[in-house]
Amino acid sequence: MGARRLRVRSQRSRDSSVPTQCNQTECFDPLVRNCVSCELFHTPDTGHTSSLEPGTALQPQEGS
């Protein structure tokens, strides 16, 4: 999954007016206001790895 421009969720974030771009293995963490290493998920039934989508029952990828 390629890098994407993010909508910063918190107006309290230091860089709230500037969208943050993270590389492929990272995502934006509003807690630390920076890109951090980000793990992917897989669905237990299919084993497919994907970005975590709201409302889906996913488990963290084992051993990552």
């Epitope: 969720r9 934006f28 963490d29 807690l31 709201p54």
Partner: antibody, heavy 125, light 107 residues
């Protein structure tokens, strides 16, 4: 296997100093934020500080600001909490923890997934 | 700072009971809430993150819900090993604050 091991706790007099260490294995601390959380005897969890080693960002609880300093040495894969001007109310078990992030549409969805065993700091005369 | 108000502070329940713990944030925090379980003398364990996602290895009897300011942790059928203290924590903005905890005791 991911593991965090704290050390450096002990008995110290009010006004004294201690440095806690959090040695990480099984992952590189530069890729995550590392947090210190404390728990006074019989009380709840209180977040103390975090460091993002990759860029050196830090933040502190108001109760320790100006007295405690969090840092990290990525070459040693270890985080530290330097505690100065210690007070009786700093008496607690101190845990270090890793914040894990999972990708939710490019934004971190996460929590503190690995914790150390804790180290007891007692401030008393 | 965002305050996390947890209720109840303690509850008594029996094995097999359905238990619900709530956490209210003083400001809107989207779904940036995690839930932890802690047993005496042990470090906390992550149960739920992003309000509703079950952490790896956590039994499916645990579930989380909510967004905005109101969040819930539910244990669908309490087991003997579930008697512990539970904490919510927000991570929408620093400092990441914990609720005061809910102690689940045996009735």
């Amino acid at each position: 296997e991911v593991q965090l091991v704290e050390s450096g706790g002990g008995l110290v007099q009010p006004g004294g100093s201690l440095r806690l260490s959090c040695a990480a294995s099984g992952f590189t601390i530069s890729s995550s934020s590392i947090h210190w959380v404390r728990q006074a005897p019989g009380k709840g969890l209180e977040w103390v500080a975090w460091v993002l080693p990759s860029v050196g960002f830090t933040d502190y609880a108001d109760s320790v600001k100006g007295r405690f300093t969090i840092s990290a040495d990525t070459s040693k894969n270890t985080a530290y909490l330097q505690m100065n001007s210690l007070r009786a109310e700093d008496t607690a078990v101190y845990y270090c923890a890793r914040r894990v992030c999972y990708n939710r549409l490019g934004v971190c969805a996460g929590g503190m997934d690995y914790w150390g065993q804790g180290t007891l700091v007692t401030v008393s005369s | 700072d965002i305050q996390m108000t947890q209720s109840p502070s303690s509850l008594s329940a029996s094995v097999g009971d359905r238990v619900t713990i709530t956490c209210r944030a003083s400001e809107e925090i989207a779904t940036a809430v995690a839930w932890y379980q802690q047993k005496p003398g042990k470090a906390p364990k992550l149960l739920i993150f992003a309000a509703s996602f079950l952490y790896s290895g956590v039994p499916s009897r645990f579930s989380g819900s909510g967004s905005g300011t109101d969040f819930t942790l539910t244990i669908s059928s309490l087991q003997p090993e579930d008697f512990a203290t539970y904490y919510c924590q927000q991570s929408e903005v620093s400092p990441p604050t914990f609720g005061q905890g809910t102690k689940v005791e045996i009735k």
